[in-house]
Interface confidence: low
């Protein structure tokens, strides 16, 4: 009987299983919340996507609780943001603190889940667009005229409690055009355009986006006629191009009078240190510049010479105050690159505030959207504005100033100054990385060791980044591309006050022959340009050692005086065995240290590259 | 006016059933969570049992758990409780009491005047 | 469960005196994310349901006088009436809604000395 009764149950639930199958009842399918924002850091919602109904009537509810705490919540407010969604209001939202949210959807067949989601209300916020845009065509008297845009941001937004920082981008373009163009426009909540088309009628538009977060949707279109007339006076322009031309006239004619050596000291300042690559009289005679510009060091990375291969060098100081070490290549483009500004022209090598982690916005050590905790929820929704020609890191930018913390491909981030006109200061540092990572290694065919393991990437990056570099225009570019490419560790080299020394009148030249093994510099006295071809170097009679320095000429020959009794070389040798380098060296440059380690005192420290201070010498040879 | 009225109480024999119904009016209804509060007489207060606004998630206290149900009718604006396996100890005064947020996690801001429910036999 | 005990049963305080009532939580019903204590306090008259004091703790219900205040955080709580007036003669309840099921205090007898 009980058998009976079991079976007739079976058959029952079988029946009514089937029954449901075939009506097409099942339990839901799996929700999936695909969104969540937040338009101020104080109030959020969460969107979720319904499975399958499995053809019943399905309830969803949404339950969360908070890292770090074990109490499950569900949705406070289904309402507000409307059909399936959770809105947080402030009494629920807390920065700073994980949200792990659930959705369940229930029917009666059963019930199913989403995955979880965690959600961080610091990197789901996507402002309002801002408010009041204004455009208006400027014309000013004999300049260029161009268009003002103006704006507010959006209202829900605190600006003056540094809680927020609202980042914008501007876009724009002829009514009739299929393509925007683009400006970003940092924090200014103004910006001025000038290339535009005269008679056009244009679409302006501005979005906004925290430090973290999204970009909020673009304001509504403002329209702008530009005036047929907007154009410069023609006067204006053709008393401009006049002055161009006047100008790279007078360069290429002061260019081909100056010749020889001088031409060389104008357009290539010298580069301090003892061993840096002259130039061979015949070269400048001949003309050859190929092996010219290898003796300026500019051949590729590494150097395939020893030391002893070396082209003749001259040791050249430069007595100037005001005028820094540049690296040779430094006039060829002083105007490109990015220029590390600073107000103070101290002695700093800047390293230290590159590495600081007290100088870096704290945010920049935040996860980036931790991709193992945090997905984008909202992975399945196209891209707002795929015609957005570059993407601005949530994470790393926070602006100060108009410096700009960008991230650098690690978890690290990078200071960039950028350039700021108003700032210069005549007494500028080097003017792009590549200058630097030369001065860092010397002229090519020095060793190149100053250069810690990321400085050493820098090297590898330094041709591409000059290249890079000398075809970016504005400066919102040179931004982009550092922001991509840029390495932490790249050395910032400061240079170093000069110590001025008196001169004394010239008593000879010389040129450096060799570094001995003892580490003595061997000498010889060069012949004037106009005294015929140089005596070979290398013969025995002219290889004298010298030992002190008579003074320094105007344009920054060293002047040796020859020291017969050579008694000074014993002391380089003395002095030198008790100085350990200050850095791991090769044979060149063990050789170089025991000439550099006269005294401490002679040592300028730059960077970790050691440079002679003539001033010591002066002393220490007297 | 907003205000809750609580109807269906009544004498009821042990293990019998009762429902007790609560008509809202003055506000959405659907956006708010609703809760049954009891007291049985001369005691204090007790959370009975709470369901969300528009899914009508539910939460119940351990007494009741399994015998007492609670619902809620959004187009009716009527909140209700079936009680089943009615014992002694479900005699009280129930109040319905409206929470200040969709959910049950808030605050309860408004109560209707109560309806008795006495189990004797 | 959350479990609400409230201090002392009873308590005759003369008019225009100070009264306090307290509320121990069994855990702490204090969201350190929000910084809120989801804690409540009704008062309930002679023959008339609960009605809403305090909210979040310390948060004065709109049309409370004044004299009645919140105070307390985690797992302890006080109820102050600053100048007791007679129609304050009530029982009045500590509720906590941090998590379910959302328990009550036993109450507290305020009366008249």
């Known amino acids: 009987m009980k058998e009976n009764v079991a079976s007739a149950t079976v058959f029952t639930l079988l029946l009514f299983l089937n029954t449901c199958l075939l009506n097409g009842q099942l339990p839901p399918g799996k929700p999936e919340i695909f969104k969540c924002r937040s338009p101020n850091k104080e109030t959020f919602t969460c969107w979720w996507r319904p499975g399958t109904d499995g053809g019943l009537p399905t309830n969803y509810s949404l339950t969360y609780h908070r890292e770090g705490e074990t109490l499950m919540h569900e949705c406070p407010d289904y309402i507000t943001g409307g059909p399936n969604s959770c809105h947080f209001g402030k009494q629920y939202t807390s920065m700073w603190r994980t949200y792990i949210m659930m959705v369940n959807a229930t029917n009666q067949m059963g019930s199913s889940f989403s995955d979880e989601l965690y959600v961080d209300v610091t990197y789901i916020v996507q402002p309002d667009p801002p408010l009041e845009l204004a455009v208006e065509v400027k014309q000013p008297e004999d300049r260029k005229p161009y268009l003002w845009i103006k704006w507010s941001p959006p209202t829900l937004i605190d600006l003056k409690t540094g809680w927020f920082t609202l980042l914008y981008e501007i876009r724009l373009k002829p009514e009739k055009a299929a393509e925007w163009e683009i400006h970003f426009a940092g924090q200014q909540t103004e910006f001025k355009i000038l290339s535009l088309h005269p008679g056009q009628k244009y679409l302006v538009q501005v979005r906004c986006k925290p430090d973290h977060g999204y970009w909020s949707a673009w304001s509504p279109a403002t329209f702008i006629q530009i005036p047929s007339d907007f154009t410069m006076n023609d006067t204006t322009v053709w008393i401009s191009v006049a002055v161009l031309s006047a100008v790279i006239c007078l360069i290429i004619v002061w260019a081909v009078a100056l010749k020889g050596y001088s031409m060389v000291t104008c357009i290539f300042p010298p580069v301090p240190g003892p061993k840096i690559k002259g130039f061979d009289a015949h070269l400048l005679e001949k003309g050859k510049s190929e092996e010219l510009l290898s003796a300026l060091g500019c051949q590729d990375f590494p150097p395939t010479s020893d030391y002893e291969d070396l082209l003749v060098e001259y040791l050249e100081v430069d007595d100037s105050e005001d005028q820094h070490l540049m690296s040779v290549h430094s006039k060829e483009h002083p105007s490109q690159g990015m220029k590390p500004t600073y107000l103070d022209p101290d002695t700093d090598s800047g390293r230290g505030s590159c590495d600081s982690p007290s100088l870096l916005s704290e945010k920049c050590e935040e996860p980036q959207a931790n991709p193992s905790t945090f997905y984008d929820p909202e992975v399945i929704e196209k891209p707002e504005n795929p015609e957005t020609t570059h993407t601005w890191d949530p994470q790393c930018i926070s602006m100060e100033g108009k410096i700009p913390y960008f991230h650098a491909g690690g978890s690290k981030c990078s200071t960039w100054p950028l350039p700021q006109p108003s700032q210069h200061n005549p007494r500028s540092s080097y003017h792009n990385i590549t200058d630097v990572c030369e001065l860092a290694v010397g002229p090519a065919g020095a060793p190149a060791t100053l250069l810690n393991e990321a400085g050493k990437d820098a090297l590898k990056s330094s041709q591409t980044i000059k290249s890079r570099e000398e075809g970016k225009a504005t400066q919102q570019r040179e931004v982009e591309s550092f922001h991509s490419e840029t390495d932490q560790d790249t050395p910032w080299l400061l240079p170093q006050e000069k110590t001025p020394f008196g001169s004394a009148k010239p008593l000879d030249y010389v040129e450096i022959h060799k570094v001995n093994k003892d580490g003595a510099l061997s000498l010889l006295p060069k012949q004037r340009e106009n005294s015929g071809k140089p005596k070979k170097p290398g013969t025995p009679e002219n290889n004298k050692e010298y030992a002190k320095v008579s003074g320094v000429m105007d344009n920054n020959i060293l002047v040796l005086v020859p020291d017969p009794h050579a008694k000074n070389v014993a002391c380089f040798e003395e002095s030198a065995k008790e100085a350990p380098p200050s850095l791991e060296q090769n044979q060149a440059e063990k050789a170089l240290a025991n000439f550099t380690a006269t005294s401490s005192k002679c040592r300028l420290q730059l960077g970790g590259l050691d440079y002679l201070d003539p001033a010591c010498f002066t002393h220490s040879f007297h | 006016e907003v205000q809750l009225v609580e109807s269906g109480g009544g004498l009821v024999q042990p293990g019998g059933s009762l429902r007790l119904s609560c008509a809202a009016s003055?506000?959405?209804?659907?956006?708010?969570?609703m809760t049954w509060v009891r007291q049985a007489p001369g005691k204090g207060l007790e959370w009975v049992s709470a369901i969300t606004g528009s899914v009508g998630n539910t939460y119940y206290a351990d007494s009741v758990k399994g015998r007492f149900t609670i619902s809620r009718d959004n187009s009716k604006n009527t909140l209700y409780l079936q009680m089943n396996s009615l014992g002694a100890e479900d005699t009280a005064e129930y109040y319905c009491a409206k929470g200040a947020g969709m959910t049950t996690n808030w605050y309860l801001d408004l109560w209707g005047r109560g309806t008795l429910v006495t189990v004797s036999s | 469960d959350i479990v609400m005990t409230q201090s002392p049963d009873s308590l005759a305080v003369s008019l225009g005196a100070r009264a306090t009532i307290n509320c121990k939580s069994s855990?702490?019903?204090?969201?350190?994310?929000?910084?809120?204590?989801?804690l409540t306090w009704y008062q309930q008259k002679p023959g008339q349901p609960p009605k809403l004091l305090i909210k979040?703790?310390?948060t004065r219900e709109s049309g409370v006088p004044d004299r009645f205040s919140g105070s307390g955080s985690g797992t302890d709580f006080t109820l102050t009436i600053s100048s007791l007036q007679a129609e304050d003669v009530a029982v009045y309840y500590c509720?906590?809604?941090?998590?379910?099921?959302?328990?009550f205090g036993q109450g507290t007898k305020l009366e008249i000395k």
């Open positions: 003055g506000f959405t209804f659907s956006s708010y969570a």
């Open positions: 855990q702490s019903v204090l969201y350190s994310s929000n910084n809120q204590n989801y």
């Open positions: 979040w703790a310390s």
């Open positions: 509720q906590q809604y941090a998590s379910s099921p959302y328990t």
